[in-house]
Interface confidence: low
Amino acid sequence: ELCDDDPPEIPHATFKAMAYKEGTMLNCECKRGFRRIKSGSLYMLCTGNSSHSSWDNQCQCTSSATRNTTKQVTPQPEEQKERKTTEMQSPMQPVDQASLPGHCREPPPWENEATERIYHFVVGQMVYYQCVQGYRALHRGPAESVCKMTHGKTRWTQPQLICTGEMETSQFPGEEKPQASPEGRPESETSCLVTTTDFQIQTEMAATMETSIFTTEYQ
C-alpha cells in the first residue's frame, strides 16, 4: 500500500530513509538536458524475498539531443550512498541495513540522474529528520515519521523535532510546550489499523552522515 502523502515538512530540517521497505518506488528522473531512454524503466522498485531485497529495474538517461544512451550503474544492494546534511544532534549507532529484512538500501546514483530523487513510500516506511546546517534541535522528541494506515487511509506520524538557529535563544527551558505543539494537532488521528515497524531502525540512526543533502545532486 503506497502512502498517499509525502512525509511532514519540518522547518529547517531534512528527512531521509535509512532503508526502504519492499514496494518502495524511485522515479527514474534525469537532469536537465537528458531524458529516459525510450524503452527505459519509469521507476526502480524495491523487491525481494525473505532473505534478500534489492532494486528491480535500472534507470537510464540519454541526452535529449542524441540517441546514445549513457553508461548505467546497475543498483547493487551492497552499495550505499547516504544523502543527508549536517551532524546529528546526539550520537547514535549506524544501522546495518543488510540486517533489515524486507528493506533495500539507498540506490547508487545513475549517470545524469536528476538533482532530486522522488520516492513513493509504502505503509510502514520510516524516515528520519535532522536539522540542517546552522540549526540545532530543541527539546527533541522522536525525530522520525512513520507512514501508517488509519481507517483505510495513510498518514505520517508527526516528527517532534524543532530546529532553531544557533544564535536564537531557546524558548523551551525545561519541559515547556513546543510551538504549535506537534502533538496537539486538530485533525483526528485515531487509528483503525496500523502496520508494525522495525523498532531497531527507529532508534539506531547514523551518528555521522555524508554532508550531501537528501535532495541534492550528486557531484
Epitope: G141, P142, K148, Q160, E183, R185, S191, Q202, T203
Partner: nanobody
Framework: EVQLVESGGGLVQAGGSLRLSCAAS????????MGWFRRAPGKEREFVAA????????LYAGSVKGRFTISRDNGRNMVYLQMNSLKPEDTAVYYC????????????????????WGQGTQVTVSS
Amino acid sequence: EVQLVESGGGLVQAGGSLRLSCAASGGTFRTRNMGWFRRAPGKEREFVAAVSWNVDNKLYAGSVKGRFTISRDNGRNMVYLQMNSLKPEDTAVYYCAADNIPLSSDMRPTATEYDYWGQGTQVTVSS
C-alpha cells in the same frame, strides 16, 4: 526489541488506590508516547490514559478522568498510572503501550495505534 513490563496491580477495595508502573527497555524511551489500556472480562481493550513524549499532553478516558493520573519519568524509563477512588467497574487487566503516534487532544487513541505492549497487570476492585 522494545519491552514493557507492568507492575503494581492487585486486589483493592472500592474507594481505594493503586499505582501501576510500567518499565520500558530496549529502545529510546524518551521518544515514545505512552499509554495505558485495560481489558475487562468479556470486553474489548479500551483506552485509559496517554502521555506525550515531553509530558505536555495528557489524555484520559471519560470514565477515569479526575480519578486517574498518568505520569512518566524519562530518566528512569518509567510510566505510572495513579488510580484513586477505584470502582468495581475498574476491574481489568491493565496494559502499558508505547508508540510515536501524535496525541490529538480531541480524539482518544485506540489500541491498534500502539505497536508495543506489555503483558498486563491484573487490577481487581472488590465492593
